[in-house]
Amino acid sequence: CKAMHVAQPAVVLASSRGIASFVCEYASPGKATEVRVTVLRQADSQVTEVCAATYMMGNELTFLDDSICTGTSSGNQVNLTIQGLRAMDTGLYICKVELMYPPPYYLGIGNGTQIYVIDPEPCPDSDF
């Protein structure tokens, strides 16, 4: 089957500091040296790009400086962390993997990770 399977967890709960981490794993049909990983957020029928990084196999993922994502790679596995999340960012986060080089190109799209974000309760004022 000329297709690439991408696996990611179904559900992740963000920390109280608005940080969510999950693993995106892909079964590569070819020996890629250059891989692009994109995180998409789907809310209703709207899809937006959260972040993207292209990396050479064996090297680290490098997101743009202003990206809310960080990540590390190990073989066919990418560990993704999204920070700065708030309750309104709760949604389905989809991992998209593309084997860019060498040919042939392959596309793999995960089923998505539902990330739940709960805003922390504000600390009550304390009188001393």
Partner: antibody, heavy 118, light 108 residues
Framework: QVQLVESGGGVVQPGRSLRLSCAAS????????MHWVRQAPGKGLEWVAV????????YYADSVKGRFTISRDISKSTLYLQMNSLRVEDTAIYYC???????????WGQGTMVTVSS | EIVLTQSPGTLSLSPGERATLSCRAS???????LAWYQQKPGQAPRLLIY???SRATGIPDRFSGSGSGTDFTLTISRLEPEDFAVYYC?????????FGQGTKVEIK
């Protein structure tokens, strides 16, 4: 709104060159793969070429490899197709199309006609 | 290269009828990477279905896609006058990107 507009088509003799342009607007050009697809008169759709995000990785159909060059100017949000050594069988409407977030071609230009004839 | 074969070549139907279009792949295609397009004379193709069964933005629900492996189907539940056109399937999971030869849905 999201839009692709092709230009540069025309009538050209076999062996000559032509450069097509596709001006994109309404979306972040660098976030999408951009394709050229052609359609010979009365025929079906044939994928021609693609250039990715940074413009470094490019793929071509065997029928145009070595003759056509795809490129993009991110600062101008414009896609190009340089067509050299044109053949009669290259006669077609050429469409540029955006590879959407999920990979399918979700936005298409109106097409530009290229006729290769002596 | 994945070859896509569409059938029938032409489908002659009346408005209000159900249209069933078939797309068969030469090798297994993940349903995540199969699309259907509509093309009317003198117009560019328009994306109808992606991921074998997800409707693109603004596509009416009379259009539906199904299938997996090597066999995929586009169904138009009740043909409207504006649905008479040529329909193409496409795989986009690996290069080269390939299209079927098309099915023409014409008025009977």
């Amino acid at each position: 709104q999201v839009q692709l507009v092709e230009s540069g088509g025309g009538v050209v003799q076999p062996g000559r060159s032509l450069r097509l342009s596709c001006a994109a607007s309404g979306f972040t050009f660098s976030s999408f793969g951009m394709h050229w697809v052609r359609q010979a008169p009365g025929k079906g759709l044939e994928w021609v070429a693609v250039t990715w995000y940074n413009g470094r990785n490019k793929y071509y159909a065997d029928s145009v490899k070595g003759r056509f060059t795809i490129s993009r100017d991110i600062s101008k949000s414009t896609l190009y197709l340089q067509m050299n050594s044109l053949r009669v069988e290259d006669t077609a409407i050429y469409y540029c199309a955006r590879g959407g977030y999920y990979g399918a071609f979700d936005i298409w230009g109106q097409g530009t006609m290229v006729t290769v004839s002596s | 290269e994945i070859v896509l074969t569409q059938s029938p070549g032409t489908l002659s139907l009346s408005p209000g009828e159900r249209a069933t279009l078939s797309c068969r792949a030469s090798q297994s295609v993940s349903s995540s990477y199969l699309a259907w397009y509509q093309q009317k004379p003198g117009q560019a193709p328009r994306l109808l279905i992606y991921g074998a069964s997800s409707r693109a933005t603004g596509i009416p629900d009379r259009f539906s896609g199904s299938g997996s492996g090597t066999d995929f189907t586009l169904t138009i539940s009740r043909l409207e006058p504006e649905d008479f056109a040529v329909y193409y399937c496409q795989q986009y999971g690996s290069s080269p990107w390939t299209f079927g030869q098309g099915t023409k849905v014409e008025i009977k």
